[in-house]
Interface confidence: low
Amino acid sequence: SAPFSFLSNMTYHFIRIIKHEFILNDTLNQTIIRANDQYLTAAAIHNLDEAVKFDMGAYTSSKDDTKVPVILRISKTQLYVSAQDEDQPVLLKEMPEIPKTITGSETNFLFFWETHGTKNYFISVAHPNLFIATKHDNWVCLAKGLPSITDFQILENQA
């Protein structure tokens, strides 16, 4: 298990939901879909109704304003994306409401959202060298990079 970084000792405060019902596509034009009640996967789909819609909630970060800490929730549910360890699938965890504050082990729910042009990256706050990633014929997981795909396009207004 990768050690938690010092960032895990910080407290993050919820600001607001900044994106509603968006879809994530990787650079192979695979879309994130549900694999089962606990996991996500990526597949080439023909109908965007099949895609998972996400909401993104922003949190304050006193350390580095260039990195926005966000939480990812499946729209119209109480399921949140939670990081595990390297090459482990991200989990969908149920919480009754969006956390007002996040600290310690709960930073598994937070990702630094970075954008470079049309590319979007989600870096685990708990494991700052690991990204949300897709992998051929596998679950959405945490990875450092290739052969997993770590950059995503955000498709908005898909409701």
Epitope: I33, D37, Y39
Partner: antibody, heavy 122, light 107 residues
Framework: EVQLVQSGAEVKKPGASVKVSCKAS????????MNWVRQAPGQGLERMGW????????TYADDFKGRVTFTLDTSTSTAYMELSSLRSEDTAVYYC???????????????WGQGTTVTVSS | DIQMTQSPSSLSASVGDRVTITCRAS??????LNWYQQKPGKAPKLLIY???RLKPGVPSRFSGSGSGTDYTFTISSLQPEDIATYFC?????????FGQGTKLEIK
């Protein structure tokens, strides 16, 4: 081959509890949630809830909250359903079923156990 | 909870007949509709998911269609082994409710 094998039939008295097991094989147990569904004689299907096999967290349907408990033994890839304070209307076949989301958020149950008959009678 | 209403509750048909079962949801379920087959004394089996997609290994005589609140399950040419009860189930919102079932018999 994916298989879910359930424990045998049970006869219980009103007020008692019953615990049904469901042993999974042929796939990675922790990667798929396990549902419990019941079917009263000659009736339809009623989903009781599910357990997250990775975290152990359970979600119960409103009609069963407070009376049902789902547990796991991950070392043997076995899920359990315990129903307490049994009454005659709990007489039913109880199924475990693996869940899958084939597309988007479309929830389905792709593999089922053979069912366990629970009879509640004084 | 979303209510699922299936019709008819039972039907009798001959081998080779085209058989149709309908399922209506109490609200829009966005094509998140599954069909199961249950033979007497057996567990249900998933046949169709997401309105029209056949689970691998399911014969092509089974099909599904629909949208919004109204969905249809069709057997294009009834076979003796198709005698069973068929259930629809909405896959959109927990507790993922089922229809009451349609019992199919051979004339």
């Amino acid at each position: 081959e994916v298989q879910l094998v359930q424990s045998g039939a049970e006869v219980k008295k009103p007020g008692a509890s019953v615990k049904v097991s469901c042993k999974a094989s042929g796939y990675t147990f922790k990667y798929y949630g396990m549902n419990w569904v019941r079917q009263a004689p000659g009736q339809g299907l009623e989903r009781m809830g599910w357990i997250n096999t990775y975290t152990g967290q359970s979600t119960y349907a409103d009609d069963f909250k407070g009376r049902v408990t789902f547990t796991l033994d991950t070392s043997t890839s076995t899920a359990y359903m315990e129903l307490s304070s049994l009454r005659s209307e709990d007489t039913a076949v109880y199924y475990c079923a693996r869940d899958i989301y084939y597309y988007g958020s479309d929830f389905a149950m792709d593999y089922w156990g053979q069912g366990t008959t629970v009879t509640v009678s004084s | 909870d979303i209510q699922m209403t299936q019709s008819p509750s039972s039907l009798s048909a001959s081998v080779g007949d085209r058989v149709t079962i309908t399922c209506r949801a109490s609200q829009d379920i966005s094509n998140m509709l599954n069909w199961y087959q249950q033979k007497p004394g057996k567990a249900p089996k998933l046949l169709i998911y997401y309105t029209s997609r056949l689970k691998p290994g399911v014969p092509s005589r089974f099909s599904g269609s629909g949208s919004g609140t109204d969905y249809t399950f069709t057997i294009s040419s009834l076979q003796p082994e198709d005698i069973a009860t068929y259930f629809c189930q909405q896959g959109k919102t927990a507790p993922y409710t089922f229809g009451q079932g349609t019992k199919l018999e051979i004339k």
